[in-house]
Interface confidence: low
């Protein structure tokens, strides 16, 4: 089996109206507190030079970073949405734990590193921005991994 066949999520993950609504509500709440509108974390640049078959692996990297470095340190904010969305995203992360790629991941690592550096450079407002883009993270995971 090719290694990246494990880079799959069930479509049912994205068809639960309640948690989808909570994820989008969380993103909306955070985007209201985001003053930096000229920076986009999850956009065309993130996928530049990454083939369609490797995009789920890329999104796995972004998801794990978002969970560990953004959502958990900010987990006391944006209640009650945060306490419901974090376990949902953790479940998706666990489902992608065996997702790896066999080929060259240089472009992926470069793009993920750029996203991480942008968030870190912006400090806490970068974390707020990342939470404000959870709707984009959600849609990108769906598009790349289903």
């Amino acid at each position: 089996l090719p290694v990246n066949t494990r880079c799959k999520l069930e479509v049912s993950n994205f068809q639960q109206p309640y948690i989808v609504n909570r994820t989008f509500m969380l993103a909306k709440e955070a985007s209201l507190a985001d003053n930096n509108t000229d920076v986009r974390l999850i956009g065309e640049k993130l996928f530049r030079g990454v083939s369609a078959k490797d995009q789920c692996y890329l999104m796995k990297q972004v998801l794990n970073f978002t969970l560990e470095d953004v959502l958990l340190p900010q987990s006391d904010r944006f209640q009650p949405y945060m306490q419901e969305v974090v376990p949902f995203l953790t479940k998706l992360s666990n489902q992608l734990s065996s997702c790896h790629i066999s080929g060259d991941d240089q472009n992926i690592q470069k793009n993920v590193r750029r996203l991480k550096e942008t968030v870190k450079k912006l400090g806490e407002s970068g974390e707020i921005k990342a939470i404000g883009e959870l709707d984009l993270l959600f849609m990108s995971l769906r598009n790349a991994c289903v």
Epitope: D76, R77, F78, G123, E124
Partner: antibody, heavy 117, light 107 residues
Framework: QVQLVQSGAEVKKPGASVKVSCKAS????????IHWIRQPPGKGLEWIGR????????YYNEKFKGRVTISADKSISTAYLQWSSLKASDTAMYYC??????????WGQGTLVTVSS | AIQLTQSPSSLSASVGDRVTITCSAS?????MHWYLQKPGQSPQLLIY???KLASGVPSRFSGSGSGTDFTFTISSLEAEDAATYYC??????????FGQGTKVEIK
């Protein structure tokens, strides 16, 4: 219910150090920011810094950077404020407090630190 | 860091009066929070995220405002409301700042 219990009052000489503790209970300690805030006698509230116990990440008020260390021990759900090179002007009530969203919702009872020669 | 200026710094009012305290931020903030502190006690959260009432807080307390101008109101002052009130923001990362406080006394 959420409780923050601080260590007892301290009397120190100028130039000395002090370490104040804040024992948390009633919630998941690693998941919420703990802030340290001080209040000199008869004055207002001044934010010192905060720690996210889950990762150990800290932020400090620039005014206190270098003289203050905030730490946490997840295993015993306790946060610490260590202050070095104390001055008479550091005499204050020191509070630990737990965040909720953007606010500081739960406060310890305070620890009075008196710096006097 | 964003500066918060409370007005007035102190006031004296009678039981039943409507009391208003303002908090002005040096630049725009997302939310304002309000605390009361009685002598010898720790501060207590009253209003969070500008207008939400903290658990167990009486409905005579309210908050409003946006941007740089925020207001805290006690609709009908009670004797037990004698205290110092503080506004606070956490929008200028990573700083938290407090207003200088407003002391409310009962006539």
């Amino acid at each position: 219910q959420v409780q923050l219990v601080q260590s007892g009052a301290e009397v120190k000489k100028p130039g000395a150090s002090v370490k104040v503790s804040c024992k948390a209970s009633g919630y998941i300690f690693r998941s919420y920011w703990i802030h340290w805030i001080r209040q000199p006698p008869g004055k207002g509230l001044e934010w010192i810094g905060r720690i996210y116990p889950g990762t150990g990440r800290t932020y400090y008020n620039e005014k206190f950077k270098g003289r203050v260390t905030i730490s946490a021990d997840k295993s015993i759900s306790t946060a610490y404020l260590q202050w070095s090179s104390l001055k008479a002007s550091d005499t204050a009530m020191y509070y630990c407090a737990r965040s909720y969203d953007y606010s500081v919702a739960y406060w310890g009872q305070g620890t009075l630190v008196t710096v006097s020669s | 860091a964003i500066q918060l200026t409370q007005s007035p710094s102190s006031l004296s009012a009678s039981v039943g009066d409507r009391v208003t305290i303002t908090c002005s931020a040096s630049s725009s903030v997302s939310y304002m929070h309000w605390y009361l502190q009685k002598p010898g006690q720790s501060p207590q959260l009253l209003i969070y995220e500008t207008r939400k009432l903290a658990s167990g807080v009486p409905s005579r307390f309210s908050g409003s405002g946006s941007g740089t101008d925020f207001t805290f109101t006690i609709s009908s002052l009670e004797a037990e409301d004698a205290a110092t009130y503080y506004c606070q923001q956490w929008s200028s990362n990573p700083y938290i700042t407090f207003g200088q406080g407003t002391k409310v006394e009962i006539k």
